[in-house]
Interface confidence: low
């Protein structure tokens, strides 16, 4: 198989080195020459020629392949020209010859992928590998080949990417800290509890890849899908030269699904305790897990220990399945929070779902705000509300919704960021229900919407009322 990697080498006598401390040369003969017909001789400048012991392999398709593995490491020297020639002993003729530098004929053995697992974000894949010859790993570059594992489509899309060793890991900016300036105050950012943009292809060229030594992280994959992956390496072309080695044996990995699919929502009320909730699946049990990471750059240990998220008592102990599962844990404000939900179906199959990582200050849920109103003229309401949290008044945005009596559809209004009230024009002599909710969406704090306030019933007057 590796021989085919040298196909672009036009020399009849092909040579390669796995570790630059070894050398293998071979050539193919179509003719059925008797055993012992050929000798492979070699010599460094100003040295006597020596014979390299040959073995032959019958190649039914080609004839015979003659192979020489240099017997002694001492005979393999870098940066000196090595003369090689094949002599026909019986005909006393040179069959073929070449001059090479061992340092330019590298064909590294494939790395061994030792671990492949989901990364810290949905659609991320993290792999680590071992280099068969660690002493040359600094002089190699790596390429990763991967694609979706689809039994129905063995020729699914494949991505081949060079691993960028100069990058340590993806910049760990604050997860999802989208600038609040370029959006309406209450626009939904892509938060761990909301639908982000859907990935359309499991192997888009946009997927990012970074590496640190013997590990790398791929992103932009399809959460919940299975992937196969392979690695190969080649000399960097600066210190050492050669060709791409063969691909490692394929490794397959099942990526966790995106917890968005379960409607995962995590929040804190006190910046200490985090509560997570997700939709309970029919005929399935589920369990939440969490871990904290302080990673700014590549952590030494990329394989975290997940801790149990303490399950909350079911709110309805009746027979029907509760709508949500909830769990809670103590958190820290100096770490990124990672959430995993495992759903076990009746046959015992476990499906994992990964939440998008977040900081605790990105998941602050406000208490439900109180709404006060007075009618200043017919159908003209003045609204007021108390900030649920005075400490973050300037980062709090609100949504007001109202509906006419007997109507199903709600009209939603978004007052300006930090507003403490507003006015509302309604039809005179009509009945309405009004509700208010709040959430943090500033540079310091963000979080999910509070629950809607209890409906406030308003009956507008016929004429001006003070």
């Amino acid at each position: 198989q590796d021989v085919s990697l040298l196909a672009s080498d036009s020399e009849p006598l092909k040579c390669f080195s796995r570790t630059f401390e070894d050398l293998t040369c071979f050539w193919d003969e179509e003719e059925a020459a008797p055993s012992g017909t050929y000798q492979l001789l070699y010599a460094y400048p100003r040295e006597k020629p020596r014979a390299c012991p040959l073995s032959s392999q019958s190649m039914p398709h080609f004839g015979t392949r003659y192979v020489c593995q240099f017997p002694d490491q001492e005979e393999v020297r870098l940066f000196f020209p090595l003369h090689l020639w094949v002599k026909n002993v019986f005909l006393n003729q040179t069959r073929t010859q070449r001059v090479l530098f061992v340092d330019s004929v590298g064909l590294p053995a494939p790395p061994s992928i030792i671990k492949a697992m989901g990364g810290s974000q949905p659609g991320e894949l993290q792999i680590s590998w071992e280099e068969p010859a660690p002493e040359i790993s600094d002089f190699l570059r790596y390429e990763l080949r991967y694609g979706p594992r689809d039994p129905k489509n063995s020729t699914g899309p494949t991505v081949i990417q060079l691993i960028a060793t100069e990058t340590c890991c993806p910049a760990l900016q604050r997860p999802h800290s989208a600038s609040a300036l370029d959006q309406s105050p209450c626009a939904q950012p892509t938060m761990p509890w909301q639908d982000g943009p859907k990935q359309t292809s499991p192997s888009r060229e946009a997927s990012a890849l970074t590496a640190e030594g013997g590990s790398c992280l791929i992103s932009g994959l399809q959460p919940g899908n299975s992937y196969w992956l392979q690695l190969r390496s080649e000399p960097d072309g600066i210190s050492l030269g050669g060709s791409w080695g063969s691909w490692s044996l394929p490794v397959t990995v099942d990526l966790p699904g995106d917890a968005v699919a379960l409607g995962l929502q995590c929040f804190t009320l006190d910046l200490k305790n985090v509560t997570c909730q997700w939709q309970q699946q029919d005929h399935a049990s589920s369990q939440g897990f969490f871990y904290h990471s302080r990673a700014r750059c590549c952590p030494r240990d990329r394989y975290p220990i997940w801790e149990n998220c303490e399950e909350e008592e079911k709110t309805n102990p009746g027979l029907q399945t509760p709508q949500f599962s909830r769990c809670h844990f103590k958190s820290r404000n100096d770490s990124i929070i990672h959430i995993l939900v495992e759903v076990t179906t009746a046959p015992g199959t476990v499906h994992s779902y990964l939440g998008s990582p977040f900081w605790i200050h990105q998941a602050v849920r406000l208490p439900t705000p109180n709404l006060h109103w007075r009618e200043i003229s017919s159908g003209h309401l003045e609204l007021e509300w108390q900030h649920p949290s005075s400490w973050a008044a300037q980062e709090t945005c609100y949504q007001l919704r109202y509906t006419g009596e007997g109507h199903q559809d709600w009209k939603v209004l978004e007052p300006p960021l930090g507003a403490r009230g507003g006015t509302l024009e309604l039809r005179p002599r009509s009945r309405y229900r009004l509700q208010l909710r709040a959430r943090l969406n500033g540079p310091t704090y963000q979080g999910p919407w509070s629950s809607w306030s209890d409906p406030t019933r308003v009956e507008t007057a016929t004429e001006t009322a003070w």
Epitope: E31, A32, P34, P60, H61, T64
Partner: antibody, heavy 118, light 107 residues
Framework: QVQLQESGPGLVKPSQTLSLTCTVS?????????WNWIRQPPGNGLEWIGY???????SYNPSLKSRVLISVDTSKNQVSLKLSSVTAADTAVYYC???????????WGQGTTVTVSS | DIQMTQSPSSLSASVGDRVTITCMAS??????LAWYQQKPGKAPKLLIY???SLETGVPSRFSGSGSGTDFTLTISSLQPEDFATYYC?????????FGQGTKVEIK
């Protein structure tokens, strides 16, 4: 035109050694190519037994390796098969075939039936 | 060993029919696949090599397709002399292995 002809005893007793020869005409077996033995139990599919190359290198099916020997008699231009310790499961039609340039069996003998029975 | 699985194991067809036989390898064999035809009491005859290449002298109604693990032999218009058993064989990895055969019978 290359022709292959298998020959050997049609009946072999259990535990004995089955010996077959394949006589090749129209081509020297030491010039080139690889010479194969394949068998087909009654009503069953084909099973590759092994080959010998023009240069005498052999390769055998691991399932039979401990019992099989393929050799050539260059003077008679024959390839021989020896299968030791036979049982009724070795009852089959035995074919020799040439593995040609394309790695496929391009020339076959007509086959010889061997029954293992006491 | 690489397992070769043919389907169907038998089929009934009429003269002029288009017949398709599939062969699946238990691992990737690239295009190292041959198809043989065998008639009762006769030795197999090579039809297709390298998955898609027609052996010299074989009628053009026979064609092969596929690569990797899934392969197909197609007879575009079945002739009376085509009623036989067909075998696929991989020659990617020793030991060479055959499919269990597909018997094409007259309907």
């Amino acid at each position: 035109q290359v022709q292959l002809q298998e020959s050997g005893p049609g009946l072999v007793k259990p535990s004995q050694t089955l010996s077959l020869t394949c006589t090749v005409s129209g081509y020297s077996i030491t010039s080139d190519y690889t010479w194969n033995w394949i068998r087909q139990p009654p009503g069953n599919g084909l099973e590759w037994i092994g080959y010998i190359t023009y240069s005498g290198s052999t390769s055998y099916n691991p399932s039979l390796k401990s019992r099989v020997l393929i050799s050539v008699d260059t003077s008679k231009n024959q390839v021989s098969l020896k299968l030791s310790s036979v049982t009724a499961a070795d009852t089959a039609v035995y074919y020799c075939a040439r593995l040609g340039r394309r790695y496929t069996m391009d020339y076959w003998g007509q086959g010889t039936t061997v029954t293992v029975s006491s | 060993d690489i397992q070769m699985t043919q389907s169907p194991s038998s089929l009934s067809a009429s003269v002029g029919d288009r017949v398709t036989i599939t062969c699946m390898a238990s691992e990737d064999i690239y295009i190292r696949l041959a198809w043989y035809q065998q008639k009762p009491g006769k030795a197999p005859k090579l039809l297709i090599y390298a998955a898609t290449s027609l052996e010299t002298g074989v009628p053009s109604r026979f064609s092969g397709s596929g690569s990797g693990t899934d392969f197909t032999l197609t007879i575009s218009s079945l002739q009376p002399e085509d009623f036989a058993t067909y075998y696929c064989q991989q020659y990617w990895s020793s030991p060479w292995t055959f499919g269990q055969g597909t018997k094409v019978e007259i309907k």
